[in-house]
């Protein structure tokens, strides 16, 4: 097992997940370690704990290793690191990676007011409604800015769009969280349409797709949903 | 479905080995990490070793030189070799699969084993 030192003097590993990293519930996750090709070991952790380990045949020129989730449940979400060592150095720790797991207990109600399609510059919230006590509400724009929002509450929660542009145009979901790693099932898709401008934007996105397989995104992490945290939340974190 | 049935526990005194064994139902065998597990009375379950599907091992510090893990890919066998048995080996040792699994990935932490034995009680005393 690793042994922390001062003398880390490798480059940092980059660490990422495929298909994504929001897993269904049962379903299997691929978590892949990139470091260098003389690396004789890989070290994966979760929670800080250490979780797997590979040594790659010195036969195959491979510059990166795959652990394989085979069931995601509550107990494998969360944050995974990974190391590498190359002769007697260890790398620095790879950037985090953040592992949510989807599909528990409940299907919260997503709507949004006044309507699904709207004007441009028109006021738009969205409203995100899970029967089940949760502390936490996450909204999802599926293929669009790469950006998910969350919101405090109980049993509801409100996304104020504000005046709306073509950028918000698109199919969303929401997700309650039992812990930051821990979400529902997702709501049922809306898709918001906005007509009028310059050109005619109210169609919905092409390519729609409902698996949450093709969803990339940061995570913001202040309760505006503004501020993204992209080395925490992308699919490859190396910055 | 993966079953899992732990064999070879036992009394034992200090010094002294056993051989315990894990018998594998089913054809994914070849395709599966296989680790041991301990759990000592009050205490939480431990890792002891494990084995990827390339026979590479790992093995806890605290076991490091006195147990052997091993399998059997033509049996569906995976076995630990105790040998200079302590006391605070005294446990229920739980084999454990992660299957399928691909590469050479050797897994420490129980949350990657998606399955499990019923255990075998392993008791070392004079």
């Known amino acids: 097992q690793r042994i922390n030192t001062e003398k880390e003097t490798l480059p940092k590993p980059i660490i990422w997940a495929k298909p994504s990293i929001m897993v269904t519930n049962g379903n299997s996750v691929n978590i892949w370690c990139q470091g260098a090709q003389s690396a004789s070991e890989y070290q994966l952790y979760f929670e800080g704990s250490f979780f797997a380990l590979e040594r790659p045949k010195p036969s195959r020129s491979m510059n990166k290793v795959r652990f394989f989730i085979s069931q995601m449940t509550s107990h494998t979400a969360g944050i995974y690191t990974c190391f590498y060592q190359s002769g007697e150095l260890w790398s620095k720790s790879s950037n985090p990676l953040k592992l949510v797991v989807t599909g528990l207990y409940d299907t919260p109600n997503l709507w949004v007011y006044p309507r699904p399609e709207v004007t441009l510059g028109e006021n738009v919230t969205f409203f995100c409604q899970l029967k089940t006590a949760t502390s936490k509400f996450f909204l999802l724009k599926e293929r669009g800015s790469n950006h998910i929002q969350n919101k405090y509450g109980n049993i509801q929660a409100e996304f104020p769009m504000g005046p709306v542009t073509r950028a918000h145009r698109g199919t969303y979901r929401c997700f309650g969280s039992y812990n930051d790693y821990a979400w529902s099932f997702p709501s049922e898709p809306v898709t918001l349409l906005i007509t009028g401008g310059v050109e005619n934007s109210s169609l919905a996105p092409t390519d729609p797709t409902s698996s949450l397989d093709y969803w990339e995104f940061d995570l913001s992490t202040n309760e505006s949903g503004l501020q993204k945290d992209s080395a925490f939340w992308d699919h490859t974190t190396q910055n | 479905e993966v079953q899992l049935v732990e064999s070879g526990g036992g009394e034992v005194q200090p010094g002294g080995s056993l051989r315990l064994s894990c018998a594998a139902s089913?054809?994914?065998?070849?395709?599966?990490?296989m680790g041991w597990f301990r759990q000592a009375p009050g205490k939480e379950r431990e890792f002891v070793a494990a084995?990827?599907?390339?026979?590479?091992?790992y093995y806890a510090e605290s076991v490091k030189g006195r147990f052997t893990i091993s399998r059997d890919n033509a049996k569906n066998t995976v076995y630990l070799q105790m040998s200079s048995l302590r006391a605070e080996d005294t446990a229920v040792y739980y084999c454990?699969?992660?299957?399928?699994?691909?590469?050479?990935?050797?897994?420490?932490?129980?949350?990657?084993?998606?399955?499990w034995g019923q255990g075998t009680l392993v008791t070392v005393k004079p």
């Open positions: 089913g054809r994914t065998f070849a395709s599966a990490a």
């Open positions: 454990a699969a992660v299957v399928p699994t691909y590469g050479n990935a050797i897994y420490v932490h129980s949350a990657a084993y998606n399955y």
């Open positions: 084995i990827s599907r390339s026979d590479d091992t």
